[in-house]
């Protein structure tokens, strides 16, 4: 209403403080000068403003930047970083790690929000890759982030960022992702001894080939069921008994278990028996004595 | 005066789903979060989530994040609580309760409905 | 999740004495801590919030003091009406979480 639009007298606000939660909607947006508040942002944060009083603050932060907040003004938003849309979001130009961080702080403990998302969003847009920084930053925040990526934006990740990796930050990675991610893995580890660079690649095998999965069964590796359970079928099928006997170590009785299992199960259908007996374990299902096995692909192949 | 009145509640299985209401009166209801608590029987108070004025941010505790989700419908004054996959510790008494900010505390509360998981 | 412990979980007392409740959290919530008070069969009813402030019709024999990671809440001459649950409460993040409670029961 017209008469609520100028400040009652005594009532302009000097500086950010507690006393403004007693100002009525009204009162704030005609009482608080809006480059008064960008400058006192961080005080925000200790003071217990109604979420209609936010409301208003960020109207005023609206009108005073409408081209998008400066970035001096976003690092210290605090819990009225959660009043913003992503359409907010997008007018930022955050470049600042610590400006990233200090708004993750915000909703940490909770789901990536849509905020959160478009935040993210555009400051690795801005700084035109995943850098380890970056990566270590965001992982800490949400260990699930790295898999909420398509392959083709983790074909931007460089190398030297998987080290930042941890195993749980793969947890929910499909084989599409980690496909992707296996190359760069073995690229940077490549310069760690057999036992280190095992520790180190076992997370991300999900992605590795035979070729590598016959050269790690050669190391005395002796890799748990949980990570040959999340090898890619096709890589596990040519490897030989021996082979994937090398590979698990003393694991390779964990084999019974999981027999009705992918990958276990299709790679004993393509076993010969005689030599699924020789591990002892009763596994059934492997071909015949005395059947010839025809690899049509390498006859397509050749032909 | 504020009100607050939950329904919806009643005896469930466990798997199924169950659906609350509160409605608030005597007060602006779009201007204010609403919360979410819960107390199993002859336990203490359990949080279970927040929803903000606009709807534009809802957290809950982990114990049923992915199972329950807050609503709420301002046109309407109705706050709401889906309940999905319920279990036996689910059983206890929700109430509704507002809070005027992300720094304040539960001002107002409802007096509560009942929610009995049991085969 | 910010964890909130209180002690006693059982207070026996008589009318006319002083008690003390306490509440620590896991991590510094600053003042932002209520207080309610729940009666058999009844909803919880706000007390003190941000550590120290009393709510609007709250006799003055309740108080609170503490910040950070420390919190009192304290009933100067315990009244019959008093003899109920008191819990705790930080909203220092949007996960509110309680204590467990601490019942003042007569002695």
């Known amino acids: 209403e017209v008469e609520k639009t100028a400040c009652p007298s005594g009532k302009k606000a000097r500086e950010i403080d507690e006393s403004l939660i007693f100002y009525k909607k009204w009162e704030l947006e005609a009482c608080v000068d809006a480059a008064l508040l960008a400058t006192q942002m961080d005080r925000v944060n200790a003071i217990p403003f109604t979420y209609e009083q936010l409301d208003v603050l960020k109207h005023k932060l609206d009108e005073l930047y409408p081209q998008g907040y400066p970035e001096s003004v976003i690092q210290h938003l605090g819990y009225l970083f959660l009043k913003m849309s992503p359409e907010d979001i997008r007018k930022w130009n955050v470049t600042s790690l610590e400006t990233l961080k200090a708004l993750l702080e915000v909703n940490k403990g909770h789901e990536m929000s849509p905020q959160v998302a478009t935040l993210i969003d555009r400051f690795v847009k801005g700084r035109g890759q995943l850098d380890k920084d970056t990566l270590d930053t965001l992982t800490a925040f949400y260990p699930g982030y790295l898999c909420s990526l398509s392959p083709e934006e983790l074909s931007s990740v460089p190398p030297s960022s998987i080290w930042a990796v941890r195993p749980q930050d793969l947890d929910t990675c499909d084989p599409r992702q980690l496909d992707v991610l296996y190359p760069k893995a073995r690229l940077a580890f490549q310069n760690m001894n057999g036992s280190e660079y095992f520790v180190k690649i076992q997370s991300f095998l999900g992605g590795a080939p035979t070729e590598d999965l016959k050269a790690l069964s050669q190391q005395n590796v002796s890799m748990d069921l949980a990570t040959f359970m999340k090898l890619r079928t096709d890589a596990v099928l040519p490897l030989t008994v021996a082979e994937v006997q090398k590979l698990l170590g003393p694991h390779v009785e964990g084999l019974k278990a999981e027999e009705r299992h992918r990958p276990v199960r299709d790679w004993i259908l393509r076993q010969r028996q005689d030599d699924l007996d020789t591990l002892g374990l009763g596994l059934q299902g492997g071909i015949p004595n005395g059947y010839l096995v025809l690899d049509l692909s390498m006859q397509e192949a050749l032909s | 005066q504020v009100q607050l009145v939950e329904s919806g509640g009643g005896v469930v299985q466990p798997g199924r789903s169950l659906r609350l209401s509160c409605a608030a009166s005597?007060?602006?209801?779009?201007?204010?979060?609403m919360n979410w608590v819960r107390q199993a029987p002859g336990k203490g108070l359990e949080w279970v989530a927040v929803i903000w004025n606009d709807g534009s941010n809802k957290y809950y505790a982990d114990s049923v994040k992915g199972r329950f989700t807050i609503s709420r419908d301002n046109s309407k004054n109705t706050l709401y609580l889906q309940m999905n996959s319920l279990r036996a510790e689910d059983t206890a008494v929700y109430y509704c309760?507002?809070?005027?900010?992300?720094?304040?505390?539960?001002?107002?509360w409802g007096q509560g409905t009942l929610v009995t998981v049991s085969s | 999740d910010i964890q909130m412990t209180q002690s006693p979980s059982t207070l026996s007392a008589s009318v006319g004495d002083r008690v003390t409740i306490t509440c620590r959290a896991s991590q510094s919530i600053s003042r932002w801590l209520a207080w309610y008070q729940q009666k058999p069969g009844k909803a919880p009813k706000l007390l003190i919030y941000?550590?120290?402030s009393l709510e609007s019709g709250v006799p003055s024999r309740f108080s609170g003091s503490g910040s950070g990671t420390e919190f009192t809440l304290t009933i100067s001459n315990l009244q019959p009406d008093d003899f109920a649950t008191f819990y705790c409460q930080q909203y220092n993040t949007y996960s509110r979480t309680f204590g467990q409670g601490t019942k003042v029961e007569i002695k």
């Open positions: 941000k550590a120290s």
């Open positions: 309760a507002r809070d005027r900010g992300p720094l304040w505390p539960l001002d107002y």
């Open positions: 005597g007060f602006t209801f779009s201007s204010d979060g």
